[in-house]
Amino acid sequence: LCQGSNYSTCASCPSCPDRWMKYGNHCYYFSVEEKDWNSSLEFCLARDSHLLVITDNQEMSLLQVFLSEAFCWIGLRNNSGWRWEDGSPLNFSRISSNSFVQTCGAINKNGLQASSCEVPLHWVCKKCPFADQALF
């Protein structure tokens, strides 16, 4: 089904695993714990998912409803320009940054913010639902 690619469009998929929220054609996991950016990415990859890559302003607005003032890591990094983990550039929103050393992207209910990648924050994973259900 959607298992071929982490970034494929996920149409008419079954429901999401336990603790994941279905929104549109994807499953989202909002963490309770905190990790640094790399470890958040690792957490998502181990569960056949990826750190949240936001495709457009509409998806961003929908997700922000579930967020608070607390920042969450997403799949966004400044590597010669802000790029999502699927390689696409950030082109539909601005990101606030206070320093050159803040090279990882986070989101809260107010928007996108650059942060130092070592800071432990909550995170959001995104994946396609799978036909066979598992806890992850």
Partner: antibody, heavy 120, light 107 residues
């Protein structure tokens, strides 16, 4: 109830390899990551890595890459760790552990430990 | 890697004492600290998770606190069955790392 049953003690020669097992009981095997932890006599704990039995995904502590290989056999609900090119530094008790709730690295269930002794 | 430092390798205590075991992280780990108890010849046992939450079945004399880099496990009314090694662990960053342990001994 949840139980992790590890294989028995091993005495192995330097340079050899050893494969130890961790059999899971009392829960759905593919729903919980299996972690492996090393403890040398009278010393602290060292996280080796984990394997997700659902998809085989592994995450190793860099320190143990090339030393430990983690695998699972879903049909028997058993996780394995193979240690290669053994030296005296590898003599230790090795534990498998799961967090059970699956989403946090707090290890609520542990195997009884497998003592590996490397000696000529 | 994040280093978890338990500066006291041994602590002498008496039954009924209030005992505080400290653990310091080399960088901010938020509240992602776990505490374990290990008795000789046994596997570690989970006591505290997320710095301050007592795990199921753990007596309420065990409390954890701290955030950021400094963490404490307190036993409010030391019992003889509490004589053991205590380890802290951080979950903020891979590789997961543990403190070297603090052994509680009778005075």
């Amino acid at each position: 109830q949840v139980q992790l049953q590890q294989s028995g003690a091993e005495l192995v020669r330097p340079g050899a390899s050893v494969k130890i097992s961790c059999k899971a009981f009392g829960y759905t095997f593919t729903n919980h990551f299996i972690n492996w932890v090393k403890q040398r006599p009278g010393q602290g704990l060292d996280w080796i890595g984990y394997i997700n039995p659902y998809n085989g995904y592994t995450n190793y502590n860099q320190k143990f890459k090339g030393k430990a290989t983690l695998t699972v056999d879903k049909s028997s609900s058993t996780a394995y760790m193979e240690l290669s090119s053994l030296t005296s530094e590898d003599s230790a008790v090795y534990y498998c552990a799961i967090s059970y709730d699956g989403y946090y690295e707090r290890f609520a269930y542990w195997g009884q430990g497998t003592l590996v002794t490397v000696s000529a | 890697d994040i280093v978890m430092t338990q500066s006291q390798k041994f602590m002498s205590t008496s039954v009924g004492d209030r005992v505080s075991i400290t653990c310091k992280a080399s960088q901010n780990v938020g509240s992602t600290v776990v505490w374990y108890q290990q008795k000789p010849g046994q596997s570690p046992k989970l006591l505290i998770y997320s710095a301050s939450n007592r795990y199921t079945g753990v007596p309420d004399r065990f409390t954890g606190n701290g955030s950021g880099t400094d963490f404490t496990l307190t036993i409010s009314n030391m019992q003889s069955e509490d004589l053991a090694d205590y380890f802290c662990q951080q979950c903020s960053s891979y590789p997961l790392t543990f403190g070297a342990g603090t052994k509680l001994e009778l005075k």
